[in-house]
C-alpha cells in the first residue's frame, strides 16, 4: 500500500532510505534535454519472492531532439531547490541485498537520469534521519521514521531528532554510537493499525551499508 | 468538520480550457495530498492526479499527463485542476478528494461539459 | 497498470437479500478499498484496507480477500443499499477503480 504523505522534515536535518519494501516505485526521470524512451517505463518497481526481490522494468532516456511526445518531466531550476530541501545527498545502498528479505537496494543508475530520484514508498518503509554538516544531534529516541497505516489513512511517525547549530556532524545507523531498541519504538495508539514496522530486520542492516552518488526525492 | 467545496458547473467549446477548484476546510490543508478522480457519464471513476500543496509537487495517471495540470494555493486552501485542449470526451463530473491513504472526503463534483 | 474487474456489472436483488460483488486484481495488491455511489453524489468510503467498515457504515457490509480476489457482501440488503460500488487499489500508481456494480431493485 502506498504512503499517501511525506515523512516529517526535521530543521536541520535531512532522511533516507537504506532499502527500500517491495512496492517501492520510483519514477523513471531523465535529466534536461532527455525524455523516456517512447513506450518505456514509467517507474521501476521493486517486486521479490520470499528469498530475492529486485527492481522491475527499466528505465531508459533518450534525447528530446527526436520526436518529443512525453511532457518534460525533469524539475525546474528554482523547483528542484526547492525540493532538495527533504532530500539525501548520498543514499545508501546494502553491500548484501539478501540480507534484508523484502528490500530492494539503491538501483544502479541509467543513461542519462536526472538528477535525484522520486521514490514512492509503501507502507511499512523506514527512513533515517541525520543533521546536516555543520549541526549535531539531540537524540532523544531513534532518528527514523515509518510509514504506518491507521484507518486507511497513512502517517510516519515522529523521528526523536533535534539538530542543534553546533560544528559537529552526526552519522547515520551503523556509523553512531547504539541508539534506542526496537522495544523502545512508541507503539499505534489504536487498535485498528493494520501494518506491522520491520525496525528490527531495519537496524540489523544498518552497518551493513555504503553509500552511492544519488540525490534522492523521496514522495 | 472537513469539507472539500468545487466551483460549479462549466459549459466549453472544443480546443478551449476549463480551471476547476476546490476548496477545502476543517484541516490542515498543506498535510494531505489532494487528489483528482474524473467520471465521464454513465462511467466509472478514473483517478488523475494529486498535487502535495506543501511542495507543489504533482504525479500524474499517464493518461491525463498532457490533458490535466494541478495546482495548489496554500494562502486560500484551495487545489486547482486546469484541463486544456478540451473534447467531447472530457465531458465529465471532475472530483478532488483528500488524500493521505483512502479517500475519505469528496469534493460535490463539477460537472464539464465540452460541446460545440 | 493494474486492471480492477469486477463482476457482476450489474446485479439484481431484493431488500433483504444477500448480495455478493466481487472484484479481482490484474496483479496482487495489499489491500482492496470499496465506495458507494448513488446517482448525482459523489463516492462515499465504505471499506478500507479489505474488510475494515469505514465510520459510520452498517455492520450489514462486511469485506474480504486477499491478492487478487477480493468480496464485498451486503448480509440483508436495505432499501438505502441501492446503488453503484467500486473497488479501488492503491497499491501501486495509477490509482485504480473497479468499473463498478450497479445494485439495482429486482
Known amino acids: 500500500e502506498l504512503c499517501d504523505d511525506d515523512p516529517p522534515e526535521i530543521p536541520h536535518a535531512t532522511f533516507k532510505a537504506m532499502a527500500y519494501k517491495e512496492g517501492t516505485m520510483l519514477n523513471c526521470e531523465c535529466k534536461r534535454g532527455f525524455r523516456r524512451i517512447k513506450s518505456g517505463s514509467l517507474y521501476m518497481l521493486c517486486t521479490g519472492n520470499s528469498s530475492h526481490s529486485s527492481w522491475d522494468n527499466q528505465c531508459q532516456c533518450t534525447s528530446s531532439a527526436t520526436r518529443n511526445t512525453t511532457k518534460q518531466v525533469t524539475p525546474q531550476p528554482e523547483e528542484q531547490k526547492e525540493r532538495k530541501t527533504t532530500e539525501m545527498q548520498s543514499p545508501m545502498q546494502p553491500v548484501d541485498q539478501a540480507s534484508l528479505p523484502g528490500h530492494c537496494r539503491e538501483p544502479p543508475p541509467w543513461e542519462n537520469e536526472a538528477t535525484e530520484r522520486i521514490y514512492h514508498f509503501v507502507v511499512g518503509q523506514m527512513v533515517y534521519y541525520q543533521c546536516v554538516q555543520g549541526y549535531r544531534a539531540l537524540h532523544r529516541g531513534p532518528a527514523e521514521s515509518v510509514c504506518k497505516m491507521t484507518h486507511g489513512k497513512t502517517r510516519w511517525t515522529q523521528p526523536q531528532l533535534i539538530c542543534t547549530g553546533e560544528m559537529e556532524t552526526s552519522q547515520f545507523p551503523g556509523e553512531e554510537k547504539p541508539q534506542a531498541s526496537p522495544e523502545g519504538r512508541p507503539e499505534s495508539e489504536t487498535s485498528c493499525l493494520v501494518t506491522t514496522t520491520d525496525f528490527q530486520i531495519q537496524t540489523e542492516m544498518a552497518a551493513t551499508m555504503e553509500t552511492s552518488i544519488f540525490t534522492t526525492e523521496y514522495q | 468538520q472537513v469539507q472539500l467545496v468545487q466551483s460549479g458547473a462549466e459549459v466549453k467549446k472544443p480546443g478551449s480550457s476549463v480551471k476547476v477548484s476546490c476548496k477545502a476546510s476543517?484541516?490542515?490543508?498543506?498535510?494531505?495530498?489532494m487528489h483528482w478522480v474524473r467520471q465521464a457519464p454513465g462511467q466509472g471513476l478514473e483517478w488523475i492526479g494529486y498535487?502535495?500543496?506543501?511542495?507543489?509537487?504533482?504525479e500524474y495517471n499517464q493518461k491525463f499527463k498532457d490533458k490535466a495540470t494541478i495546482t495548489a494555493d496554500e494562502s486560500t486552501n484551495t487545489a486547482y485542476m486546469e484541463l486544456s485542449s478540451l473534447r467531447s470526451e472530457d465531458t465529465a463530473v471532475y472530483y478532488c478528494?483528500?488524500?493521505?491513504?483512502?479517500?475519505?472526503?469528496w469534493g460535490q463534483g463539477t460537472l464539464v461539459t465540452v460541446s460545440s | 497498470d493494474i486492471q480492477m474487474t469486477q463482476s457482476p456489472s450489474t446485479l439484481s436483488a431484493s431488500v433483504g437479500d444477500r448480495v455478493t460483488i466481487t472484484c479481482s486484481a490484474s496483479?496482487?495488491?495489499?489491500?482492496m478499498h470499496w465506495y458507494q455511489q448513488k446517482p448525482g453524489k459523489a463516492p462515499k468510503l465504505l471499506i478500507y484496507?479489505?474488510?475494515n467498515l469505514a465510520s459510520g457504515v452498517p455492520a450489514r457490509f462486511s469485506g474480504s480477500g486477499s491478492g487478487t480476489e477480493f468480496t464485498l457482501t451486503i448480509s440483508s440488503l436495505q432499501p438505502d443499499d441501492f446503488a453503484t460500488y467500486y473497488c479501488?487499489?492503491?497499491?501501486?500508481?495509477?490509482?485504480?477503480f473497479g468499473q463498478g456494480t450497479k445494485v439495482e431493485v429486482k
Open positions: 478528494a483528500r488524500g493521505g491513504g483512502v479517500f475519505d472526503y
Open positions: 476543517g484541516y490542515t490543508f498543506t498535510s494531505y495530498r
Open positions: 498535487i502535495r500543496p506543501k511542495k507543489g509537487y504533482t
Open positions: 496483479s496482487s495488491i495489499s489491500y
Open positions: 484496507t479489505t474488510s
Open positions: 479501488h487499489q492503491r497499491s501501486t500508481y495509477p490509482l485504480t
